[in-house]
């Protein structure tokens, strides 16, 4: 087989039960209804066709029910962001139910053997809920399958099995090996729920990718194109490695989809939003922040149905930890240049200049090259809310800086002798929000001063002849 | 192994119902779809929806909702596809198939001739 | 929908030469493409599943490639059982879609 995991065991070969079950007295699969934060406090066991536990424990039919089901597992135990997820669910929605699907005697096995389990485990969540239906005041419609990895595609069966329609599935970076390109029933899919979101935070196109690349629901959101995490490079867990961890490396960003969803249920007053976009690349020139046509949507929990979309990806910056959330800045910038500038792509940092806070000194990140006389889309973000723009400072940096300009600016003066100055003129930057969608156009100072060079700098105010400002009231107002 | 035994073939006048039947043996009948697939003599495969007994969850494609409808009896391991106001447009082998990869099993097909 | 497109109807190859057989989403549909064979008078049988995993039983003289809009479908050396029609199929979303087929002639 050319793919790097081999199929999961025939169709013929699939028993009625696993092979993990045959021996063992204790399910499987347990429903553990957790009835306190406590990690230690055990919490009531549900069974299907036993009444009692429900009555005993204080299920609240009528209120929300969220299902947390873990993925593959190395130790056998329950990780700590299990527990993080139960608090905070606790925190945000004080009357719901918070059943933690326990699989883990099937989950601790050969990655392949897990897998071929997953179907039989969402089979049991599946039998579970259909068992509840049967109460009074109970509805399919409050039901929210939270499946972390290998967890995620059997929240996909649970909701493919069950007697009706989950209310809603979030998929926290669900399992790439065996799922990618796999049967739109043989993993997590739009048809698996009444709403599916999906947080994709370990793709990678080339060697394996531990979560799942293509998009699989209704919304399918990307942070950091889904693929390198900030906090989660080599040097940051260099104390993890030193520790005979490298596992650590991958964990981090795989785990990273539960920590920005648990952001959104206790940070509710920094929520992060996440841009429609075709791909990786154009989000990164800053194209895609628009909130028209619902291309925009709150991150995690907060995230609003769109049903009408289906495998839409999402995307946003974020910080390396909580709170998570960035302000995003699309810039766009018009070069003109009198003479050729040759290859030499100009190292450009804006510092922008709020009512509330300033920026540091951010690059402009080129992602393929800059278009001289033309106009240049470029994407920046802050980690603080600046407030109102008043003014920006575009820098060149110098030549000296850079052994990749200094050789580019060598080349080009042999292939140029006689025009070895570099120069381009900016008269206005139009920047918008992604936070708050309003635009506004800054102009420089004085009209005659457009130009820089490598080493200058170049002063930015808002434009005298009625800067534009669209959109007053940020849309996001009815999301938060 | 997993087999899928289909029903005969049938010969019905315009305007008329026929019910096909698939029974299905070899493997848990309720937690796999069935489809059913549409081939005109001389054209391709034409997916025209399917069915996960278990939940009698069903999916069709636009054009055939109001022509085909999907049951399932698990006691007897059988899928049915009943075709209504036959038309000589639905003259065709009509076959099921059981998904899991792909279409991984598929039966021998029962062919359906509409004529006056 | 999803329009799946196999350019070629027909193709003809000789015993031992290897043939491609071309298939062309409309929209991308990743690595969830199935390819099909179908002999005369008999039902399709699953060759290929997500673009390149073989199926069960299925000789190793066949095989897929292609992932987004683009797939490939590939008999390394053609045997004269292999006359027979092949169809690709996405399986990324509802409806599934089928490819117009492509009828492989042995000469």
């Known amino acids: 087989s050319p793919v790097p995991f081999g199929p999961e065991g025939r169709l013929e070969d699939k028993l009625h039960k696993p092979k993990a079950t045959q021996t063992e007295v204790k399910p499987s699969v347990r429903f553990n209804l957790r009835t306190s934060k406590d990690p230690e406090h055990e919490g009531c066991y549900l069974s299907v066709g036993h009444s009692q536990p429900l009555e005993d424990c204080s299920f609240n039919m009528t209120a929300k029910t969220f299902f947390i089901i873990h993925g593959w597992t190395m130790s056998g135990i329950f990780e700590n962001w299990l527990h993080k997820l139960v608090s905070a669910l606790h925190t945000r929605e004080k009357d719901a139910n918070v059943v933690v699907v326990d699989w883990l005697p099937l989950a601790h096995q050969l990655y392949t053997d897990a897998v071929n389990n997953t179907r039989v485990v969402g089979h049991s969540i599946a039998r579970m809920l259909d068992w509840l239906q049967e109460k009074d005041d109970f509805s399919l419609g409050n039901v929210h399958l939270i499946g972390y990895s290998l967890g995620a595609h059997v929240a996909g069966y649970a909701g493919n099995f069950v007697k009706g329609t989950v209310g809603r599935i979030t998929g926290l970076d669900p399992a790439g090996p065996m799922f990618e390109g796999a049967d739109i029933h043989k993993r997590l899919s739009p048809d698996d729920a009444d709403f599916v979101d999906v947080l994709h935070t370990y793709t990678r196109s080339f060697g394996l990718s531990i979560g799942i690349q293509m998009p699989v629901g209704h919304i399918d959101i990307y942070p950091n194109g889904g693929d390198f995490q900030p906090g989660c490079g080599l040097n940051d867990v260099l104390g993890s490695i030193a520790y005979g961890t490298i596992t650590e490396v991958v964990k981090c960003e795989h785990e990273r989809a539960v920590h920005l969803f648990v952001d959104s249920l206790v940070n509710q007053d920094k929520p992060s939003f996440a841009f429609q976009c075709t791909d990786s690349n154009r989000f990164k020139k800053g194209i895609c922040l628009s909130c028209r046509k619902n291309r925009c949507n709150n991150i995690g929990y907060n995230a609003k149905k769109m049903r009408k979309k289906r495998n839409s990806k999402m995307y946003l910056k974020t910080r390396a930890g909580m709170p998570f959330k960035v302000y995003h800045y699309q810039l766009k910038v018009h070069m003109f240049s009198y003479n050729n500038s040759g290859d030499t792509q100009p190292t450009l940092y804006i510092t922008l200049y709020g009512s509330n806070a300033d920026s540091q000194n951010l690059p402009l990140e080129i992602v393929e090259k800059i278009e001289l006389n033309a106009t240049n889309t470029f994407l920046v973000y802050t980690e603080e809310d600046l407030g109102d723009l008043l003014k920006m400072r575009l820098t060149w940096e110098g030549v000296a800086h850079s052994w990749y300009n200094l050789w580019n600016e060598f080349r080009n003066y042999l292939s140029q002798p006689s025009n070895p100055s570099r120069e381009l003129y900016i008269r206005r930057i139009r920047v918008k929000s992604g936070e708050t969608q309003r635009k506004v156009t800054f102009c420089t100072q004085d009209p005659t001063k457009s130009s820089i060079s490598p080493g200058q700098e170049l002063w930015f105010h808002k434009c005298q002849d009625g800067w534009k400002m669209k959109n007053k009231t940020s849309p996001f107002v009815n999301l938060a | 192994q997993v087999q899928l035994q289909q029903s005969g073939a049938e010969l019905m006048k315009p305007g008329a119902s026929v019910k096909i039947s698939c029974k299905a043996t070899g493997y848990t009948f309720s937690t796999y779809w069935i489809a059913w697939v549409k081939q005109r003599p001389g054209h391709g495969l034409e997916w025209i929806g399917e069915i996960l007994p278990g939940s009698a969850k069903t999916k069709y494609n636009k054009k055939f909702k109001g022509k085909a409808t999907f049951t399932a009896d698990t006691s007897s391991n059988t899928a049915y596809m009943q075709l209504s106001s036959l038309t000589s447009e639905d003259s065709a082998v009509y076959y099921c198939?059981?998904?899991?990869?792909?279409?991984?099993?598929w039966g021998q097909g029962t062919s359906v001739t509409v004529s006056s | 929908d999803i329009v799946m497109t196999q350019s070629h109807k027909f193709m003809s190859t000789s015993v031992g030469d290897r043939v491609s057989i071309t298939c062309k989403a409309s929209?991308?549909?990743?690595?969830?493409v199935a390819w099909y064979q179908q002999k005369p008078g008999q039902s399709p049988k699953l060759l290929i599943y997500?673009?390149?995993y073989r199926f069960t039983g299925v000789p190793d003289r066949f095989t897929g490639s292609g992932a987004g809009t683009e797939f490939t479908f590939t008999i390394n050396s053609v045997q004269a059982e292999d006359l027979a029609v092949y169809y690709c199929?996405?399986?990324?979303?509802?409806?599934?879609?089928f490819g117009g087929g492509t009828k492989l002639e042995i000469k």
């Open positions: 199929q996405q399986h990324y979303s509802i409806p599934r879609t």
């Open positions: 997500s673009a390149s």
């Open positions: 929209q991308d549909v990743y690595t969830a």
């Open positions: 198939a059981v998904y899991d990869y792909g279409a991984d099993y």
